[in-house]
Interface confidence: low
């Protein structure tokens, strides 16, 4: 007869490892017993269980609540066993003997890898503003046994790179993202990718990029010079910008302060019915902690009747 | 001796979808990793998807990751491949491999079918 | 991936060793293919374990990235394809081949 079992037996930590001895006889033969023992190398044989072909299973102290035998049916001819809730400590070299009658003693070894599953970690860089060269996104970082593959998936244009910390008994993976600051990438996902032969699926983090900016202001209202005339009603000046964070806006004006009546409502300077003090030069005021822009325009609001008179001379020189 | 039969192949048309079936004999099917890996015509050999001994653990090839399913019953000591959305480059000699431990790597695998052919065309 | 030279070539009876690098973080093995289509034949796996039904001219073995298969006495009957194999550990976790070396015996 021979002895069957495996080369390596791969187990997540924390799961049940079966470590499989099976004796295929010839007919008639039967198996005694069958001990299993772990044998690192430069170590002594530590007994794990014994199963007796009369008596059952005997599982030593160290072992115990630890191993048991496979759900039945059984075979007699089967020396497996269950290794429960596999630690990083179980990684190691184990040997079943097997005592059979009458062909005498059998005995093969297999290897107990216990695969780590990481616990992946996430941490943005420092805060992104546009303008800065490659800048330092996020990197990820996840330890495992063996060591984990981590990666990047997002749509947003950078560089990465990796490094690996190998530990006695596992390795962590840091894996940094790097890129361009660019208003574009605001509330675009980033998110780490971490495989690794003990996970069912990839672990995913996603971290959302703020990138601190602030746009040009611009004012808009003045489109139609010729709606700015005395009496006109509901008049208004719109400061036109966006960043991140959101601008807060101010206005002042260049030439004195703000005509008695003018409503200053956020981005919105509103009017009372126009007069010809309401002429001069406005200053939209556009901050936010990044930076801050200024647009300034002129007001020259018309008087109708000198615009009418003028037209009338027009006509009569023709 | 350790015998890997494959079943399954042919001619298969675009779109559709394909089972190839292995059934294991001459070992303990239940404490092996098995393996299908195949060939294209004039190409090297292309791991394509494998499963563990226990049937808990799967690995896919980049080529057909999330067209393909492989699955073991080892009461019948069978491993099967399901692939579907075939294209062209699916054509070549599908092969069962039987590894020599518990996992499906390539580095050990210690018995192999003799292969079934398998064209993808309209 | 694995890498491992295209083509070897050596003469009747001599010693001959084809190499293969790469990131196979559980170990290599070496597949004999005779001719395209053929089925392979496993020669060496897990880095140095030889079938009982391989002769033992055949040998591997295996040193940090790098696995080694080395043929002593080579016969006319060892012309063929050798394949090496891993496990891809960094990333996908799936069986990986290199392209294969042609052995060449003069």
């Known amino acids: 007869g021979e002895l069957e079992t495996s080369d390596v037996v791969t187990v997540v930590l924390g799961q049940d490892a079966k470590l499989p001895c099976f004796y295929r006889g010839d007919s008639g033969e039967q198996v005694g017993q069958v001990a299993w023992a772990r044998v690192d190398a430069g170590e002594g044989a530590q007994e794990l269980a014994l199963l007796h072909s009369k008596y059952g299973l005997h599982v030593s102290p160290a072992y115990e609540g630890r191993v048991e035998q496979p759900p039945p049916p059984r075979n007699p001819l089967d020396g497996s066993v269950l290794l429960r809730n596999a630690v990083q400590a179980d990684e190691g070299e184990y040997e079943c003997r097997v005592s059979t009658f009458p062909a005498g003693s059998f005995q093969a070894r297999l290897r107990l890898r216990v695969l780590v599953p990481p616990l992946p970690s996430l941490n943005p860089g420092p805060a992104l503003e546009e303008g800065q060269g490659l800048t330092l996104a996020a990197s990820c970082t996840a330890e495992g046994s063996p060591a984990p593959s981590v990666t990047w998936d997002t749509e947003v244009k950078g560089t990465t790179s990796s490094r690996s910390f190998k530990h006695s008994r596992s390795a962590a993976v840091t894996s940094e993202f790097h890129l361009v600051p660019s208003r574009s990438m605001n509330g675009q996902p980033l998110t780490c990718v971490v495989s690794h032969p003990g996970l069912l699926q990839d672990q995913r983090i996603t971290h959302i990029l703020h990138v601190s900016f602030l746009a040009e202001a611009s004012v808009r209202g003045l489109e139609d010079q010729n709606l700015w005339h005395i009496g006109r009603e509901g008049a208004m000046l719109k400061c036109l910008s966006e960043g991140q964070p959101p601008p807060s806006y101010n206005w002042t004006r260049l030439d004195g302060p703000l005509p008695s009546g003018v409503r200053v409502d956020g981005d919105t300077l509103g009017f009372p019915p126009l007069t010809t003090e309401h002429s001069g030069i406005y200053v939209c005021h556009v901050s936010n902690e990044f930076s801050s822009r200024d647009s300034q325009v002129t007001v020259d609001v018309l008087d109708p009747q000198e615009d009418s008179g003028k037209q009338v001379d027009l006509v009569s020189a023709s | 001796t350790v015998t890997l039969d494959e079943s399954g192949g042919g001619l298969q048309t675009p779109g559709g979808g394909l089972s190839l079936v292995c059934k294991g004999s001459?070992?303990?099917?239940?404490?092996?990793?098995m393996a299908w890996v195949r060939q294209a015509p004039g190409k090297g050999l292309e791991f394509v998807a494998g499963?563990?001994?226990?049937?808990?653990?799967?690995g896919y090839g980049a080529a057909v990751k999330g067209r393909a399913t492989i699955s073991r019953d080892n009461g019948q000591s069978t491993v099967r491949l399901q692939l579907n959305d075939l294209r062209a480059e699916d054509t070549g000699t599908y092969y069962c491999?039987?590894?020599?431990?518990?996992?499906?790597?390539?580095?050990?695998?210690?018995?192999w079918g003799h292969g079934t052919e398998v064209i993808v065309s309209s | 991936a694995l890498t491992q030279p295209s083509s070897v070539s050596t003469n009747l009876g001599e010693t001959v060793e084809i190499t293969c690098s790469g990131s196979?973080?559980?170990?290599y093995g070496w597949y004999q293919q005779k001719s395209p289509g053929s089925a392979p034949v496993t020669v060496i796996?897990?880095?140095?374990k030889r079938p009982s039904d391989i002769p033992s001219r055949f040998s591997g073995s295996a040193s940090g990235s790098t696995a080694t298969l080395t043929i002593t006495g080579v016969r006319a009957e060892d012309e063929a394809v050798y394949l090496c194999?891993?496990?891809?550990?960094?990333?996908?976790?799936?069986?990986?081949f290199g392209a294969g070396t042609t052995l060449t015996v003069l």
């Open positions: 499963v563990n001994a226990a049937g808990s653990w799967t």
């Open positions: 196979s973080g559980y170990g």
């Open positions: 796996y897990s880095n140095d």
């Open positions: 001459g070992f303990t099917f239940s404490s092996n990793g």
């Open positions: 194999g891993g496990y891809d550990s960094s990333a996908s976790y799936v069986g990986i």
């Open positions: 491999a039987k590894t020599a431990d518990d996992w499906y790597g390539a580095d050990d695998i210690d018995a």
